[in-house]
């Protein structure tokens, strides 16, 4: 891949990014796993979904997530005076009507039931990483990525471009 980018000041512009079009440009059903090949699983508990990061038993079926890709335009610089460039944003839905959301106050990743149009908290900038990995940066909190903490998904602040290769924010997407 192109190698991972940095974040920092530039990503303040993500707040002002605009999703081009209401419908996704494409969709992809995939299993989501960590850099260390642990699976991201979703369990219905007390009428709400919990998200886990765990080792699956042999032949245990992986949970799938529907990634919906959106083309997004972002301002050319921090002042936002003009447009330059395109980004790919995604929403992630493990089951009908439920989407991953960034809860920036709690630094957590949650599954919320909601209707379209989806709130900004459900959108993540998709980064094409080295070693066939991706990372997910919050649209609502630039420089903050979905990561793994204590066998759960959490929001992790990445404070410099050198730290973007940190394994706990790297994920693998697979059709199997």
């Amino acid at each position: 891949a192109f190698g991972i980018s940095g974040v920092q000041k530039y990503t303040r512009a993500l707040h002002d990014s605009s999703i081009t079009g209401i419908s996704p440009i494409t969709e992809y059903l995939a299993s989501l796993s960590t850099y260390n090949d642990q699976s991201i699983t979703f369990a219905l508990e007390d009428e709400s979904y919990e998200i886990y990061v765990e080792d699956l038993k042999k032949d245990e079926k992986k949970d799938k997530v529907l990634l919906s890709y959106y083309e997004s335009q972002h301002p050319s610089n921090e002042s936002g005076d003009g447009v330059d460039g395109k980004m790919l944003m995604v929403t992630l839905s493990p089951t009908k009507d439920f989407w991953l959301h960034a809860n920036n106050k709690e630094h957590s990743v949650e599954l919320h039931k909601c209707e379209k149009p989806l709130p900004d908290q459900a959108f993540f900038v998709l980064h094409n990483m080295h070693s066939n990995c991706v990372s997910f940066e919050c649209k609502t909190d630039p420089g903050v990525f979905i990561g793994v903490k204590d066998n759960h998904l959490a929001l992790i602040k990445v404070d410099s471009s050198e730290n973007l290769c940190t394994e706990n924010i790297l994920f693998k997407l697979s059709e199997t």
Partner: antibody, heavy 119, light 111 residues
Amino acid sequence: EVQLVESGGGLVQPGGSLRLSCAASGFTFSSFSMSWVRQAPGKGLEWVATISGGKTFTDYVDSVKGRFTISRDNSKNTLYLQMNSLRAEDTAVYYCTRANYGNWFFEVWGQGTLVTVSS
Amino acid sequence: EIVLTQSPATLSLSPGERATLSCRASESVAKYGLSLLNWFQQKPGQPPRLLIFAASNRGSGVPARFSGSGSGTDFTLTISSLEPEDFAVYYCQQSKEVPFTFGQGTKVEIK
């Protein structure tokens, strides 16, 4: 305005060395993966090398591995290509390119600098 | 290495006509459900300019007459009605894997 300006090209003898520079402006340099792409006179485009925003990863086309080194100085907003053991077939216009935010494609290109390897 | 083959090598058309350019990959350029195939335009003495990314999405400031389609290994760039400024060389490029490769180019010339 996003701008990439290459410099350092010129005439060099086979076996010689040259260092190309690319000065970036109008964006937060360290947030983007950068690459070099070359074009021999009258020919098509060839990707040469890429470096990640945080300098963690580099990749090269096989034909330049061990001879060329891509690097960057994020404090100076500058990309470099150190070219050693130059050959006639390295003669080309060398373009500095910036990936889009997220690193999916080459989005911004400089005007290029011509490197001529000849005795 | 993924080899990209463009056809035709040269396309001779008049302004107002429709141009259809083809790019075929030696293997699929799909990754993460995306077709990582991009199109660039290059005019003499100028650097390439991004037209289309991920097979079908226009770059910033690219006119609507340019459109891309295709998936897997077969891709098409269409210019619905050629303007005088569209006569140039067009390259496809894959960003699925290193080494990133380009097609040999299609020259669209005035008939």
